[in-house]
């Protein structure tokens, strides 16, 4: 089941999925001046069996001015730095995503890919939030959001994160230890049962990740 909305946006924060649940789709978008090859896929799809998940289809872009198809290459470091994604492209993978059953890793970049990745998430997907560079967490409760099914409708739980400019905060008595909770909203506040995610095993690890994994500013 696809999630109806995008994950919540938080002022001066970005979000990232550490892995993508089977059923997730990633649009094959090309940067300006390029287009999908004629017979090319519209999207990549995370699929798999009980032991292994991977992305089906390959995205390929070609110059709008020529008919030549492009080969799949990894961008040079300068190009990589330019790329922004909806969930913040990360220079390293802090979690061993291959060991997470039913999930795919971040897909590798393709040549002349658009600067922003558009994902279509499925129920059970979890994303993690971090303040952007120049901001820090004034308050951090459970700083993740999960797409859940409630009353036949999908919704994202609310991440509890407030970011403030580093010079704005009156007092920082001690560094916060991020809390890891699978719920964006306490169960006592929901009026019926909701589906849970099998992605919660990552919460503890991802909630304590170094901020260095979140390098791309995206608002």
């Amino acid at each position: 089941e696809l999630c109806d909305d995008d994950p919540p946006e938080i002022p001066h924060a970005t979000f990232k999925a550490m892995a993508y649940k089977e059923g997730t789709m990633l649009n094959c978008e090309c940067k300006r001046g390029f287009r999908r090859i004629k017979s090319g896929s519209l999207y990549m799809l995370c699929t798999g069996n009980s032991s292994h998940s991977s992305w089906d289809n390959q995205c390929q872009c070609t110059s709008s001015a020529t008919r030549n198809t492009t080969k799949q290459v990894t961008p040079q470091p300068e190009e990589q730095k330019e790329r922004k994604t909806t969930e913040m492209q990360s220079p390293m993978q802090p979690v061993d995503q291959a060991s997470l059953p039913g999930h795919c890793r971040e897909p590798p970049p393709w040549e002349n890919e658009a600067t922003e990745r558009i994902y279509h998430f499925v129920v059970g997907q979890m994303v993690y939030y971090q303040c952007v560079q120049g901001y820090r967490a004034l308050h951090r409760g459970p700083a993740e959001s999960v797409c859940k099914m409630t009353h036949g409708k999908t919704r994202w739980t609310q991440p509890q994160l407030i970011c403030t400019g580093e010079m704005e905060t009156s007092q920082f008595p001690g560094e916060e230890k991020p809390q890891a909770s699978p719920e964006g909203r306490p169960e006592s506040e929901t009026s019926c049962l909701v589906t849970t995610t099998d992605f919660q095993i990552q919460t503890e690890m991802a909630a304590t990740m170094e901020t260095s994994i979140f390098t791309t500013e995206y608002q």
Epitope: A137, I162, G174, S188
Partner: antibody, heavy 118, light 107 residues
Amino acid sequence: EVQLVQSGAEVKKPGATVKISCKGSGYTFTDYAMHWVQQAPGKGLEWMGVISTYSGNTNYNQKFKGRVTITVDKSTSTAYMELSSLRSEDTAVYYCARSYGNYPFDYWGQGTLVTVSS
Amino acid sequence: DIQMTQSPSSLSASVGDRVTITCKASQDITSYLSWFQQKPGKAPKTLIYRANRLVDGVPSRFSGSGSGQDYTLTISSLQPEDMATYYCLQYDEFPYTFGQGTKLEIK
């Protein structure tokens, strides 16, 4: 049921200090930050500051020029707002309000009237 | 600080009327704007957040729109119980700042 219950009305003399409490219940108190908002009689709303109920981090509105101090007692799920050097223009209703995810103030306290009079 | 200029400061309208209240921020607040309704002697109640997201339980006659610096609250068909004062709030930057309020009266 989520509730924010504030302490009762106060009458203070100019120059005094007032401390108002706001007790949260029905939810995990330390997951949600707490804000304080002032409303003078017949006037609009003024944001005073916010505290992280988890870490104690605060951010204040400089309009209150260091007269406001927000604290938290996690053991009793209570936030406090202290306003010092009171003057007559501090006569107002003071609200605590919980911050919920990507929007502030999903639940409010009932308000506490503070009257400053000589 | 970001200034929020709300207009009109008061208005009178009839039941069934379409009512609009506007808020202008002194800088781009990237849609981090909420609308509140406050009735006399009561705490404010959130109607809209993120400029256009309706809070659960709020009647669908209320809607929000706008981006950048300019935002609007619309009541599509005014009801007697909508008599109240309405405030906007920006929460893009600290300190959070409210509009001056719009007092809505029923003719």
